[in-house]
């Protein structure tokens, strides 16, 4: 006569995390009597996950009905499953006893595998701006994915980018695992419409990979180029001198006018033109009366950017004899420019 | 699906006696037989249970004079040094008690003990 | 050893009364619901009712319905019908597969 066998079917399933799953166990016999039992682990430290005689397991639910006559069917579902779930389950029949029940047979396991999605992707940049031909580091992040197996790309404008390096913690086994890759991007002076975007695909998303985007528009300092020159005279008396600003970006950017040396008028850049590139242009008007300087006047147009050291252009404005002898007091006046393109 | 016992009648004190149990329309393999008694006018009285051969369990007072088998069709119960208290109508029923309680009965058989 | 005691040892009650037969155990009963009731008709077999306590058998009517739990437990026969004239008996289970004991039976007569 042969005695209770205790089946498990499978040797493994895989669930996606916040299902249900299924652990499938049978026995042959009715004897002896004594109740079931599952167990997520082997060994003394094993975690009881249910117990047909006794207790609240809130998650658990029999597939069958347990007080049916003749049930051999001691097959459980556990609710919302979640990667910490993962782990190698365990039937097994209890034989009555006193004063406590003795374990009678195991089943074989299964082991639960548990698919969880990737987190989406955080794609983060570098703290400081770096101007064209520089390299600029950035960090895409996902957490939480179950299995380990994972395909990770880095996009610049829609291609793929070969330079970066990704690891997938930890090592060993998990119930969940994080991936972080770092790739590195050559800047260029047309970046600040650029993307970076951090694909990430698993088998959890169904061939709908996640992105993390990034603009490099937060990662470029694109530094201004000036040139001052002197318009045509509205009057005998007036010099017209512009600086023209051009190309740069972020917006931030403070003008200074010097006349030999001497600031003459400090302003800060509102209304720009935006190139199609994302960069800016902008022009900066001053009106000398050369009839208040005895000698040539040196213009210096000095550019504060992003916060970054000054740069200046200069441009002598020569006095003719005519003006000089006419000049009297040192007077001048100056006009902002109206916004214009270039 | 029924028990049909077998075996019973008169047997002096001292005496033993074999009874049989045959099951119809299900097979024994899985189930627990198990045996009551009951004596003229009285109560019901358990005997124990025949699982399979290394699952067998009897009541206290009944360990050593009483000892059961099984095949996959009929059980057994085999009674040694009887005595008049013995005397009952004693019956096989399918079952193992607790979850796996005792749900298809023979309709029992009498062993009377008397000299 | 478990031992079970059945209260009253006998009754008598009319058609579609309310009966209700408690059963008392020595110590919690295994697993608090190693209980079944069982129906005996003289000169016949016993047939199971009730099982794991509250556990309805197949077959029996809806009338009948057990609850309890440890050490206290009652069967109750909602509308006592013609045919429910029989003696019940509870079989209670220790924590030893050997250790389950039936009460003395409860006798229910016609009133």
């Known amino acids: 006569e042969d005695e209770l066998q205790v089946i498990q079917p499978e040797k493994s399933v895989s669930v996606a995390a916040g299902e249900s799953a299924t652990l499938r166990c049978a026995m042959t016999s009715l004897i002896p009597v004594g109740p079931i039992m599952w167990f997520r682990g082997a060994g003394a430290g094993r975690e009881l996950i249910y117990n047909q005689k006794e207790g609240h397991f809130p998650r658990v639910t029999t597939v069958s009905e347990l007080t049916k006559r003749n049930n051999l069917d001691f097959s459980i579902s556990i609710s919302n499953i979640t990667p910490a779930d993962a782990g190698t389950y365990y039937c097994v029949k209890f034989r009555k006893g006193s004063p406590d029940d003795v374990e009678f047979k195991s089943g074989a396991g299964t082991e639960l595998s548990v698919r969880a999605k990737p987190s989406a992707p955080v794609v983060s940049g570098p703290a400081v701006r770096a101007t064209p031909e520089h390299t600029v580091s950035f960090t895409c992040e996902s957490h939480g994915f179950s299995p380990r197996d994972i395909t990770l790309k880095w996009f610049k404008n829609g291609n793929e980018l070969s330079d970066f390096q990704t690891n997938v913690d930890p090592a060993g086994d998990s119930v969940s695992y994080s991936i972080h890759s770092t790739a590195r991007v050559v800047l260029t002076r047309g970046d600040v419409h650029s993307q970076v975007i951090c694909e990430i695909a698993h088998i959890t998303l169904q061939g709908d990979p996640l992105r993390g985007t990034a603009n490099l528009s937060e990662a470029i300092r694109v530094p201004p180029t000036l040139e001052v020159t002197q318009q045509p005279m509205r009057a005998e008396n007036q010099a017209n001198v512009t600086c023209q600003v051009s190309n740069f970006y972020p917006r931030g950017l403070q003008l200074t006018w010097l006349e030999n040396g001497n600031v003459s008028r400090t302003e800060t850049a509102s209304t720009l033109i935006e190139n199609k590139d994302g960069t800016y242009n902008w022009m900066s008007w001053l009106l000398v009366n050369t009839c208040a300087h005895r000698d040539d006047v040196v213009l210096t147009c000095q550019v504060e950017h992003d916060g970054q050291q000054a740069v200046s252009k200069s441009y002598a404005l020569e006095i003719s004899a005519h003006q000089k002898e006419h000049g009297s007091d040192i007077t001048h006046e100056a006009a902002l420019a109206p916004t214009a393109p270039l | 699906r029924q028990l049909v016992e077998s075996g019973g009648g008169l047997v002096q004190p001292g005496g033993s006696l074999r009874l049989s149990c045959a099951a119809s329309?299900?097979?024994?393999?899985?189930?627990?037989i198990s045996w009551v008694r009951q004596a003229p006018g009285k109560g019901l009285e358990y005997i124990g249970t025949?699982?399979?051969?290394?699952i067998t369990y009897y009541a206290s007072w009944a360990k050593g004079r009483f000892t059961g088998s099984k095949t996959s069709s009929t059980a057994y119960l085999q009674m040694t040094s009887l005595r008049a208290e013995d005397t009952a109508v004693y019956y096989c029923a399918r079952g193992s008690a607790w979850n796996d309680p005792f749900d298809y009965w023979g309709q029992g058989t009498l062993v009377t003990v008397s000299s | 050893d478990i031992v079970m005691t059945q209260s009253p040892s006998s009754l008598s009650a009319s058609v579609g009364d309310r009966v209700t037969i408690t059963c008392q155990a020595s110590q919690s009963v295994y697993g608090n619901n190693d209980l079944a009731w069982y129906q005996q008709k003289p000169g016949q077999a016993p047939k199971l009712l009730i099982y794991?306590?509250?556990t309805l058998a197949t077959g029996v009517p809806s009338r009948f319905s057990g609850s309890g739990s440890g050490t206290d437990f009652t069967l109750t026969i909602s509308s006592l019908q013609p045919e429910d004239f029989a003696t019940y008996y509870c079989l209670g289970g220790g924590d030893d597969e050997a250790d389950n004991t039936f009460g003395q039976g409860t006798k229910v007569e016609i009133k």
């Open positions: 329309g299900f097979s024994l393999s899985s189930h627990g």
């Open positions: 025949i699982g399979t051969g290394v």
């Open positions: 794991l306590a509250s």
